[in-house]
């Protein structure tokens, strides 16, 4: 399992805000309600990326192919770019993914999974309050 400790979190955060977040919301758009229970959490940034990686790329019985979605492709590119050695760990996973059938419909289970992803990303980009305040005072 990849260790996300040495990733450039600020660069990943910027990529998320710029593109990935919009693709996640596009995926969720049109749903009547997004009030799924949050069952997945994370306690620090590396842990958040571990959970995001798992939910985005590991197929589950009722939601097999999120990895083909635009947000997943961008997530993969972002992690490959800003996490040293990440792309090497994904070669086997990518080869296995190519054998799977393409998703035909967005199932409620997939919507729930993407809702969980939005929650994990929100935790990941949560700025440390004290450090932000120090930065704010320093520059003003």
């Amino acid at each position: 399992m990849y260790d996300f400790t040495n990733c450039d979190f600020q660069k990943i955060e910027a990529d998320y805000l710029r593109t990935i977040s919009k693709d996640l919301i596009t995926y969720m758009s049109g749903t009547k309600s997004t009030d799924f229970n949050n069952t997945v959490s994370c306690s620090n940034r590396p842990h958040c990326l571990t959970e995001i990686q798992s939910l985005t790329f590991n197929p589950t019985p009722r939601c097999a192919s999120l990895a083909k979605e635009m947000f997943a492709r961008k997530t993969k590119a972002t992690l490959a770019l800003w996490c040293p050695g990440y792309s090497e760990t994904q070669i086997n996973a990518t080869q296995a993914m190519k054998k799977r059938r393409k998703r035909k419909v967005t199932t409620n289970k997939c919507l729930e999974q993407v809702s969980q992803l939005l929650g994990l990303w929100r935790r990941f980009i949560r700025t440390l309050l004290k450090k932000q305040l120090e930065h704010h005072h320093h520059h003003h």
Partner: antibody, heavy 121, light 111 residues
């Protein structure tokens, strides 16, 4: 300048649906990280968090009340709506809406003045 | 939902003395080294007023006699020296996980 204002029916009868509106200005609910929360203070009791809705349309509810609550937004009109179904006298309270934020602005706190709702037969 | 248990439910403190209010969370409200715990003061007929954010940070304009401490699941609000205007109900609030939740409140009376 950030302002929030709650509006509601004032008085309603048991079993009716309570509809509340939070009208706000000074920020946009389309901005990343922004959200609105609904909170109530029943007479003689403590603050109770009811529900929240975020810029990305994610919604969260107090587990004990979830089956009765509906929250929605009209970001273009700067309004958030809360509905509570099948009200009882226990729902008599002052209802507040508040701006909630992730990240940088989390240390700010903006609340409306509250609107009193009385459930009475 | 994260449950916050506040104690005591009510507290009577002499003018100039120390008031200590405790808040225990059912699970950790820490993330990446910061505690997502707030403290509010509420007086009758008014909305709650934020005193402390991130467990120990004093909001601008709040007197220095208010202080917060703690991490993980155990948090404390201290008021010292207590003044007459501090008579109010105090609430802890966690903003670590949706839905946010409040403690049951502590009513502070000044003797």
């Amino acid at each position: 300048q950030v302002t929030l204002k709650e509006s509601g029916p004032g008085i309603l009868q048991p079993s009716q649906t309570l509809s509340l509106t939070c009208s706000f200005s000074g920020f946009s609910l389309s901005t990343y990280g922004m959200g609105i929360g609904w909170i109530r203070l029943p007479s003689g009791k403590g603050l109770e968090w009811l529900a929240s809705i975020w810029w990305d349309d994610n919604r969260y509810f107090n587990a004990a009340l979830k089956s009765r609550l509906t929250i929605s937004k009209d970001a273009s009109k700067n309004q958030v709506f809360l509905k509570i179904a099948s009200v009882d006298t226990a729902d008599t309270a002052t209802y507040y809406c508040a701006r909630i934020e992730d990240g940088y602005y989390s240390y700010h706190s903006y609340w409306g003045q509250g609107t009193l709702v009385t459930v009475s037969a | 939902d994260i449950v916050l248990t506040q104690s005591p439910a009510s507290l009577a403190v002499s003018l100039g003395q120390r008031a200590t209010i405790s808040c225990k969370a059912s699970q950790s409200v820490d993330f990446d080294g910061d505690s997502y715990m707030n403290w509010f003061q509420q007086k009758p007929g008014q909305p709650p007023k934020l005193l402390i954010y991130a467990a120990s940070n004093l909001v601008s304009g709040i007197p220095a006699r208010f202080s917060g401490s703690g991490s993980g699941t155990d948090f404390t609000l201290n008021i010292h020296p207590v003044e007459e205007e501090d008579a109010a109900t105090y609430y802890c609030q966690q903003i670590d996980e949706d839905p946010y939740t409040f403690g049951g409140g502590t009513k502070l009376e000044i003797e």
